[in-house]
């Protein structure tokens, strides 16, 4: 699986979207988990409603919410009041029995608030001049950089 990078700003909310084939994953609950190590398990953070028909209802675990558009085929995760410790590698999963298929691997980056201790005339957007090479980067402020994706984790 390739990895998509989502960048958010500390203190703000970040929305992560995971598109999937609605027919292939029909009837399946979804989950959002965090990769604990290079070869470690993916620890469940939050999952959609126990009743698949109610998957559109937003479910929260702490500051993380999940909702599933089962017809459109888009799983949406919201990380509220983003903090540096939220940075990490996550997965959107489709559940079937005790198994889980990875829908998307997501790298969440948390940047400093560009408005912290700055005048509006001195506005700075993190990473604006960066070259993200092959990474597909999505921002909570809706700015996209280069398309394409990078493998993760890479082989050493």
């Amino acid at each position: 699986h390739n990895t998509t990078v989502f960048q958010g700003v500390a203190g703000q909310s970040l929305q992560v979207s995971c598109p999937y084939d609605s027919m292939k994953h029909w009837g399946r609950r979804k989950a959002w988990c965090r990769q604990l190590g290079e070869k470690g398990p993916c620890q469940r953070v939050v999952s959609t409603h126990n009743l698949w028909l109610l998957s559109f209802l937003r479910r929260w675990n702490g500051s993380t919410a999940i909702t599933d558009d089962t017809l459109g085929g888009t799983l949406t995760i919201t990380l509220r009041n983003l903090q540096p410790h939220d940075a990490g590698l996550y997965q959107c999963q489709s559940l079937h029995g005790s198994e889980a298929d990875t829908l998307r691997k997501v790298l969440v980056e948390v940047l400093a608030d560009p408005l912290d201790h700055r005048d509006a005339g001195d506005l700075w957007f993190p990473g604006e001049s960066e070259s993200f090479e092959d990474a597909h980067v999505e921002h909570s402020i809706s700015r996209s950089l280069l398309e394409g994706e990078i493998p993760f984790p890479p082989t050493s």
Epitope: P84, L111, F132, S156
Partner: antibody, heavy 121, light 107 residues
Framework: QVQLVQSGAEVKKPGASVKVSCKAS????????MHWVRQAPGQGLEWMGW????????NYAQKFQGRVTMTRDTSISTAYMELSRLRSDDTAVYYC??????????????WGQGTMVTVSS | EIVLTQSPATLSLSPGERATLSCRAS??????LAWYQQKPGQAPRLLIY???NRATGIPARFSGSGSGTDFTLTISSLEPEDFAVYYC?????????FGGGTKVEIK
Amino acid sequence: QVQLVQSGAEVKKPGASVKVSCKASGYTFTGYYMHWVRQAPGQGLEWMGWINPNSGGTNYAQKFQGRVTMTRDTSISTAYMELSRLRSDDTAVYYCARDLGYSSLLALDIWGQGTMVTVSS
Amino acid sequence: EIVLTQSPATLSLSPGERATLSCRASQSVSSYLAWYQQKPGQAPRLLIYDASNRATGIPARFSGSGSGTDFTLTISSLEPEDFAVYYCQQVSNYPFTFGGGTKVEIK
């Protein structure tokens, strides 16, 4: 074993730039954030920012914004920190340090040996 | 930015004694606090992360406690090699900041 090896000491004139390198070995370079921390002679530690070697994403302390640039070359597992418009108070030992967390921010567990940068006219 | 205040600035103790170092944050950092040891001419070494978790290879005589704004690093029985400068660091909010350090010296 996991280690970070930094480039050698530098002497620069005020207004010049310096670029310090940090070569990583013994682990998956792209899996861990790399931080840069400096320490002026006889002083404490000062965090400058991080780079995510996977995406190339960076985050700098406001104090260094506009003067610091962190980059990486994944093909040779090396991170770089460039500081421009050097002043005498930039004289310090500059450390690269790997984050303990896998693609996350926890603490700085592996440190380079440090690079002494002296700014003097 | 979050200011970390370490006390005392200097701690004069003898080998075998118990050392208690304090780190106070200007606002809550939850448990996102680390402790480092630094000896002259060397890079810092991570001792404790997440306030109370010992890093790999760190002896059991080092322990960390606290949450919110008040944190403590305890060295239960000082060994000769423990005399050094100790720094706390918060990774809760940007910019990540360090305390000013506590020097543990031989009495």
